[in-house]
Interface confidence: low
C-alpha cells in the first residue's frame, strides 16, 4: 500500500460496514481514523487504484501492523 | 430484493407509548446503519436517530432524546422504535431506512408507519 | 443543527422542460479530510417513502435516470432535471449527511403542466 496517515474524522464516524478480502496490492492509499470524541473505535478507509474507497476490517491481519504503527508515531492530518 | 417492512398503522392514546418495527430482508442486517425519521402531516423529514444493529450503539436527535427509543433484535433481523409519553405533536408517518456506506444518504426505507395519538 | 433551505418550494413545468432546484446549507457540507460534500437528495412522490437519488452532493444512486443531476459544493447545491417528465412528479428533499442530526429541508414541489 501507499502512503498512510492517521486522520482526523470530522463529527461522526466514517465507516458503517466494512469489505473483506480486498489484496494489498489494489490498495493506493489508506486513511485511519484514530479513535476520538467522534467516534470509539478505529477506521480504516482504503482509496483502490481503480478509484473507489472503501472501508476496510481493522482487525484484519496485513492491516494490523500497518495501523499500528501509524497510530503510535505517524503523520496526523486534520 | 432489499426489503424494510414496517408494521400495520396504530391508533393509540395520549400518554401511551407505541412500539413500531421494521423487518430487513435481502441483505445482511448488521452491515448498515438502521435510521429512523418522522414525518409529519406530508410535510418535511425529521432524522430521529441511527442505531448499528452489529453492536446496538446509538445516536439520537437531541430532539427526540427520552422521546424515542431505538433497539434492534439480530436474531429475527428487526429494528424497533418505541415513542413514550405520547402527545398529539407525535401524530406522524415514521419510517425506517438503511443507512449507507462510506458516503452516506439513506438508501432503502421502510413504507412507513402510520402513528395517530387520539383519545 | 445545521439548517437546510430548499428554494422554490414549489413549480410548474410542462414535460421535458429543464428544472432546477437549489438547496443551501446553514453550514459547509464538505469534508476536508476527503474532499467530499455531505449532501443527499431524496424524491417523494405522493403516497410512497421518499427514495434517494443523489449522495455525495453529485454521485446517482444506481438504477437513478441520468436526467437527474446533483452538483454544488460547500454550501450552495443544487438538483437539475434535465428533460422532466410526468413521473418525476414529487417533492424533491436535500439532506445533511455530514453531521448529526443529520436535517432535510422543506422540500421542492414539483408539478407538471
Known amino acids: 500500500a501507499g502512503p498512510a496517515a492517521a486522520v482526523l474524522r470530522e463529527l461522526r464516524c466514517v465507516c458503517l460496514q466494512t469489505t473483506q478480502g480486498v489484496h494489498p496490492k489494489m490498495i493506493s492509499n489508506l486513511q485511519v481514523f484514530a479513535i476520538g470524541p467522534q467516534c470509539s473505535k478505529v477506521e480504516v478507509v482504503a482509496s483502490l487504484k481503480n478509484g473507489k474507497e472503501i472501508c476496510l476490517d481493522p482487525e484484519a491481519p496485513f492491516l494490523k501492523k500497518v495501523i499500528q504503527k501509524i497510530l503510535d508515531g505517524g503523520n496526523k492530518e486534520n | 430484493e432489499f426489503q424494510l417492512q414496517q408494521s400495520g398503522p396504530e391508533l393509540v392514546k395520549p400518554g401511551a407509548s407505541v412500539k413500531i418495527s421494521c423487518k430487513a430482508s435481502?441483505?445482511?442486517?448488521?452491515?448498515?446503519?438502521m435510521n429512523w425519521v418522522k414525518q409529519s402531516n406530508g410535510k418535511s423529514l425529521e432524522w430521529i436517530g441511527v442505531i448499528n444493529p452489529k453492536y446496538g450503539t446509538t445516536s439520537y436527535n437531541q430532539k427526540f432524546k427520552g422521546k424515542a427509543t431505538l433497539t434492534v433484535d439480530q436474531s429475527s433481523n428487526t429494528a424497533y422504535m418505541q415513542l413514550s409519553s405520547l402527545t398529539s405533536e407525535d401524530s406522524a408517518v415514521y419510517h425506517c431506512?438503511?443507512?449507507?456506506?462510506?458516503?452516506?444518504?439513506?438508501?432503502?426505507w421502510g413504507q412507513g408507519t402510520s402513528v395517530t395519538v387520539s383519545s | 443543527d445545521i439548517v437546510m433551505t430548499q428554494s422554490p418550494s414549489s413549480l410548474s413545468v410542462s414535460a421535458g422542460e429543464k428544472v432546477t432546484m437549489s438547496c443551501k446549507s446553514s453550514?459547509?457540507?464538505?469534508?476536508?479530510?476527503?474532499?467530499?460534500?455531505?449532501l443527499a437528495w431524496y424524491q417523494q412522490k405522493p403516497g410512497q417513502p421518499p427514495k434517494l437519488l443523489i449522495y455525495g452532493a453529485s454521485t446517482r444512486k444506481s438504477g437513478v435516470p441520468d436526467r437527474f443531476t446533483g452538483s454544488g459544493s460547500g454550501t450552495d447545491f443544487t438538483l437539475t432535471i434535465s428533460s422532466v417528465q410526468a413521473e418525476d412528479l414529487a417533492v424533491y428533499y436535500c439532506q445533511n449527511d455530514h453531521s448529526f442530526p443529520c436535517t432535510f429541508g422543506g422540500g421542492t414541489k414539483l408539478e407538471i403542466k
Open positions: 435481502g441483505y445482511s442486517f448488521t452491515d448498515y446503519n
Open positions: 431506512a438503511r443507512g449507507m456506506g462510506l458516503l452516506f444518504g439513506m438508501d432503502y
Open positions: 453550514q459547509s457540507l464538505l469534508n476536508s479530510g476527503n474532499q467530499k460534500n455531505y
